[in-house]
């Protein structure tokens, strides 16, 4: 085969080798671009820096090598369309620096860097970290910082992320009301900071205030919908990027809603209860205190993350006649009572037949509606106590 | 496999108290209410109670109101039983059970509990 | 108080059948009573045979079966086998608490 002329020339079935001397100023319009998953770059003096635009279109890449070359400056966002990239050479050029953002969201096996006059920073803190832990063949190459010493001595003691405190308030917030968040902000270098409300849909009207190192957040008219719902700070520097989630709970009435009683391996009333705090819960059987046993009890399903209500069942184990009956189910937390009332029937009594009738043996689950109240203001002479903890 | 491992043999002073455990291994321990019996020589077997470990909830025996007390430790799956003021009747082997929607499924070695001046 | 009762002692011989029966004082056994049956062997080694009256526990040979026989729990091994010898307990369910039965002691001669 002829030598190839151009500047970058195929190199196996979807592989590019640019190396004739001088001819690249940028990766702009490389030939295949889409289907690369190899790109070899060697004595660009002119390719300095990298960024976003530059490695657009090249979704496919896996290896990217630009090597004796000018590099001087990798944009924190430059590998942003190459997330499948997984080797990155960028040994003897010029970098001084290199951004955890940079490598941030990347699974990068291997990461090549000897030979560029790094400069000991807190920026490079991610790097020192990398080689601590072994990752991407970092140790081995046994970075050197110019003029400096080994990346490996570097002291870092003053390198951390930025500390964030939110703060939220601690009395009690109600359904409608006007919440303050605050997330104040320390360290060196911050650069950027900001609010993350995916969660929150409907759940208030976000106001949005301040700026580093002090940022404001107010939730307007807030809704029992917020409860469970995280509301994350975020700030960055030079070594990297905190968070932190905080939830405001939103004070609501007890609520309650049972079901019609259900046979699975064993029988279940089924019944799903809200408020905020986690209402008390208790049974009445026939209008009496139901105490629980292993027999009968109270049996939660796993509870949604971000959700208050819970589901669960009254669990019956092989319920005969003398279970049939009215249950009532109570719930009841500082700001209002609720209960609901289901008639259940699990077996017919033995002892109630005609003598000229068969004797019936089949289970026949009654069919009726459950009634939800609606939350009730508390009164202190409702007998309620302490029985089941829903949170 | 559901296996449930208790403490060795007490021997303890009248007056004193002791705790006895019962480590669950093998099956999600908060779901399964847990047994207690007691059985000594002439005696039979006697129902002490029963506790649910995920919420704590407990059932007695009238009889061992304010002498048993049942306590549980979700994060080493361990159930305890506490005596207080511990007297010879209390000498006997004391199992741990698990229920299994009311029915037993697994028993514990027994742990003995001699009580001696 | 409830007394559950139990034969003391039965003696049967190998293959054959072979019924053991729990009663209860405060009138017939029946299917809310929950009866369980324990087996006892030497070293305080309990197994659950069976639970709800004839629920067989997990691994429990299929000789083994549970019903209720007039006004009494039973406990019906077919084809005793020497193996079985031990001490078997019955349990029943009294609305919020267990009473057990004081045992009986089968021999398997």
């Known amino acids: 085969a002829a030598p190839c002329p151009d500047a970058c020339c195929p190199h196996g079935s979807s592989g590019l080798r640019c190396t004739r001397d001088g001819a690249l100023d940028s990766l702009h319009h490389l030939p295949g671009a889409e289907n690369l998953t190899e790109l070899y770059i060697e004595n660009q003096q002119h390719l300095q820096h990298l960024e976003l635009r530059d490695l657009r279109g090249l979704g496919e890449l896996r290896n990217l090598t630009i090597v004796k070359s000018g590099l001087r400056f990798v944009a924190p966002d430059a590998f942003h369309f190459t997330p499948r990239l997984s080797r990155l050479n960028l040994s003897f050029n010029a970098l001084e620096s290199l951004s955890w953002k940079t490598v941030q969201g990347l699974s990068l096996q291997e990461l090549v860097l000897s030979g560029n006059p790094l400069h000991c920073s807190c920026a490079l803190r991610w790097l020192q970290r990398w080689e601590e832990e072994g990752l991407g063949g970092v140790p081995e190459q046994k970075l050197q910082c110019h003029g400096q010493g080994p990346l490996a001595h570097m002291p870092n003691a003053s390198c951390g992320v930025p500390t964030l405190k939110v703060q939220v308030p601690n009395a009690s917030v109600d359904v409608g009301d006007d919440v303050l968040l605050r997330c104040q902000v320390e360290g060196r270098g911050l650069e950027q900071a900001g609010w993350i409300l995916t969660e929150l849909e409907q759940s208030a009207t976000v106001m949005k205030s301040g700026g580093l190192p002090s940022l404001g957040l107010t939730l307007a008219n807030v809704t029992s919908d917020l409860n469970r719902k995280n509301v994350t700070c975020w700030a960055e520097n030079d070594v990297g990027r905190a968070e932190v989630s905080v939830q405001v709970n939103v004070s609501f009435p007890a609520s309650v809603q049972l079901h019609t009683a259900v046979e699975m391996h064993h029988w279940c009333i089924p019944f799903s209860v809200d408020g905020q705090p986690a209402p008390s819960l208790r049974w009445l059987f026939n209008g009496s205190v139901l105490n629980e046993t292993s027999f009968i009890f109270t049996e939660f399903l796993e509870p949604a993350a971000n959700e208050t209500v819970r589901h669960g069942c009254l669990r019956l184990n092989q319920p005969t006649h003398v279970n049939n009956g009215n249950y009532t189910l109570l719930a009841a937390n500082p700001f209002g009572q609720a209960s609901a009332s289901i008639m259940a029937a699990f077996m017919d009594n033995p002892f109630e037949f005609n003598p000229e009738d068969p004797i019936p043996v089949s289970f026949s689950p009654v069919d009726t509606n459950s009634t939800s109240g609606d939350p009730v203001e508390k009164k202190d002479e409702t007998p309620f106590g302490v029985s089941v903890a829903v949170g | 496999q559901v296996q449930l491992q208790q403490s060795g043999a007490e021997l303890m002073k009248p007056g004193a108290s002791v705790k006895i455990s019962c480590k669950a291994i093998?099956?999600?321990?908060?779901?399964?209410?847990i047994e207690w019996v007691k059985q000594r020589p002439g005696h039979g077997l006697e129902w002490i109670g029963e506790?649910?470990?995920?919420?704590?909830?407990?059932n007695y025996n009238e009889n061992f109101k304010g002498k048993a007390t049942f306590t549980v430790d979700i994060s080493s799956t361990t159930t305890y039983i506490q005596f207080s003021s511990l007297t010879s009747e209390d000498s006997a082997v004391y199992y741990c059970?698990?229920?299994?929607?009311?029915?037993?499924?697994?028993w514990g070695q027994g742990t003995s509990l001699t009580v001696s001046s | 108080q409830t007394v559950v009762t139990q034969e003391s002692a039965l003696t049967t011989s190998p293959g054959e059948t072979v019924t053991l029966t729990c009663r209860s004082s405060?009138?017939?056994?029946?299917?809310?009573?929950?009866a369980n049956w324990v087996q006892e062997k030497p070293d305080h080694l309990f197994t659950s045979l069976m639970g709800?009256?004839?629920n067989r526990a997990p691994g429990v040979p299929a000789r083994f079966s549970g019903s209720l026989i007039g006004d009494k729990a039973a406990l019906t091994i077919t084809g005793a086998q020497t193996e079985d010898e031990a001490i078997y307990f019955c349990?029943?369910?009294?609305?919020?608490?267990?009473?057990f039965g004081g045992g009986t002691k089968l021999t398997v001669l």
């Open positions: 059970a698990r229920s299994n929607y009311g029915d037993y499924d697994f």
């Open positions: 349990a029943l369910w009294y609305s919020n608490h267990w009473v």
């Open positions: 709800g009256t004839n």
């Open positions: 506790i649910l470990p995920g919420r704590g909830v407990t």
């Open positions: 093998g099956y999600t321990f908060s779901r399964y209410w």
């Open positions: 405060s009138g017939a056994v029946t299917t809310s009573n929950h």
